[in-house]
């Protein structure tokens, strides 16, 4: 009976605080008045005072909004004592899991990525890989799952779809034939990273692709 299932609390809660989360209850309260307390990081040790307990009702209280990216899980201990201070239960583990909200945008690891590829290569040739990170959870939710896309290509010669990007790995590849260094020596791609697996917040960066020379022209006299 002296057990509490893991408690899930969304981060960035708006209150009002204190917010009652769950009730600690010992069945020894049938015999004697019970006083409840909690200990551990987030209660009586840093970060202090995030959680409290109503000492006679046993209600576990949240005092402020939580931030999953700061602390994703709290491990507290619940205690129950009688009026004379004698412990009536073994300390009980209380796990508080902070559930994720999509409160961070993706961030590219660089503002500008640079890569190169030989002119005249076949479609499917890999050019470079770009990377964006998102502090949100990507295991239990899609909040931190990033999808990559190409927003624009400059110049648009010989046409505007010379490259593609793998939506999950960020690998940029050649998709069309016709790369010709003598005509276009460099492409600038505006790339996007969007969280929620493509349905959330978007951030942009630039990928510069240098077209390397191949010995494809005979000398002119």
């Amino acid at each position: 009976d002296w057990v509490v299932a893991p408690i899930s609390v969304p981060e960035n809660g708006k209150g009002p605080f204190p917010q009652r989360l769950n009730q600690l209850k010992s069945n020894k309260d049938r015999d004697t008045k019970i006083f409840y307390s909690i200990t551990g990081p987030g209660a009586d040790s840093p970060p202090e005072g995030v959680f409290a307990v109503e000492k006679e009702t046993g209600w576990l209280l949240l005092n402020k909004p939580l931030d999953r990216e700061e602390i994703a899980k709290y491990e507290l201990f619940g205690h129950a004592v009688s009026e004379n201070g004698a412990s009536v239960e073994d300390p009980m583990n209380i796990s508080i899991i902070v559930t994720d909200q999509n409160d961070h945008k993706p961030k590219f690891t660089q503002d500008t990525f640079r890569g190169s590829v030989l002119e005249g290569v076949l479609p499917g040739t890999s050019v470079m890989q770009v990377t964006a990170t998102d502090e949100d959870d990507a295991i239990y939710t899609y909040n931190g799952v990033v999808a990559y896309s190409i927003h624009s290509q400059e110049p648009k010669d010989p046409h505007d779809l010379m490259f593609t990007i793998h939506r999950s790995t960020g690998t940029i590849s050649v998709i069309s034939s016709g790369l010709d260094r003598e005509k276009v020596p460099e492409y600038t791609l505006t790339i996007q990273a969007t969280d929620m697996d493509g349905d959330g917040s978007t951030t942009t960066a630039v990928a510069v692709v240098e077209i390397l020379d191949a010995n494809d022209n005979a000398p002119m006299f």
């Epitope: 009002p16 204190p18 209850k25 970060p47 409290a52 009702t57 209600w59």
Partner: antibody, heavy 119, light 112 residues
């Protein structure tokens, strides 16, 4: 025996900021909810807001835009600031401790300090 | 906000006789396992309020056992089994369920 003592000016001019301090003696400020409550003839007893010892605050929505409560654990004190006061803020201001049985249950009160808002 | 309504607003009493004050809330103050988040305070003349009863029926430390609290949900009662002269003052109920806590308008108890 925990005791609370309010201090601060008894007269504040309209549009200025009311500032009061509550000193906690005979016990620690840790582990409790410390509130400010005021009492005026017109509105009766009105809860203003609280601070938990680790600096988490919560204010009455009707006063939220004007209230700041802060704590100095090293001095065992907590303070109230109420900005842009008007005559309607004239009242006896009490500091109190909550959190013994339920988190409100104000079990210890200061003796109160009368604050008049007048030019 | 939860509105608290007390009655009567004035209560003349005779020492040694019982007295009763009613308090009604605009919504239920019960919150699991039978806990009612309703507190009673007494403000004696010239003093600050003092906690009498918390969680509906629990006497605060040092409060004489002639004071008792009862009720559940939205209707609550404070009873004084035998009024003493020192019991005069204004009695307030307060809901402690939700932020902001709110007080009743007070019941003035005075000796006849």
């Amino acid at each position: 025996q925990v005791q609370l003592q309010e201090s601060g000016p008894g007269l504040v001019k309209p549009s200025e900021t009311l500032s009061l301090t509550c000193t906690v003696s005979g016990g620690s400020i840790s582990g409790y909810y410390w509130s400010w409550i005021r009492q005026s003839p017109g509105k009766g007893l009105e809860w203003i807001g609280y601070i938990y010892y680790s600096a988490n605050t919560n204010y009455n929505p009707s006063l939220k835009s004007r209230v700041t409560i802060s704590v100095d654990t090293s001095k065992n004190q907590f303070s109230l600031k109420l900005s842009s006061v008007t005559a309607a803020d004239t009242a006896v201001y009490y500091c109190s401790r909550g959190g013994s049985g339920s988190y409100w249950a104000f079990d210890i009160w200061g003796q109160g300090t009368m604050v008049t808002v007048s030019s | 906000d939860i509105v608290m309504t007390q009655s009567p607003l004035s209560l003349p009493v005779t020492p040694g006789e019982p007295a009763s004050i009613s308090c009604r809330s605009s919504q239920s103050l019960m919150y699991s396992y039978g806990y009612n988040y309703l507190d009673w305070y007494l403000q004696k003349p010239g003093q600050s309020p003092q906690l009498l009863i918390y969680l509906g029926s629990n006497r605060a430390s040092g409060v004489p056992d002639r004071f008792s609290g009862s009720g559940s949900g939205t209707d609550f009662t404070l009873k004084i089994s035998r009024v003493e002269a020192e019991d005069v003052g204004i009695y307030y109920c307060m809901q402690a369920l939700q932020t902001p806590p709110t007080f009743g308008q007070g019941t003035k108890v005075e000796i006849k």
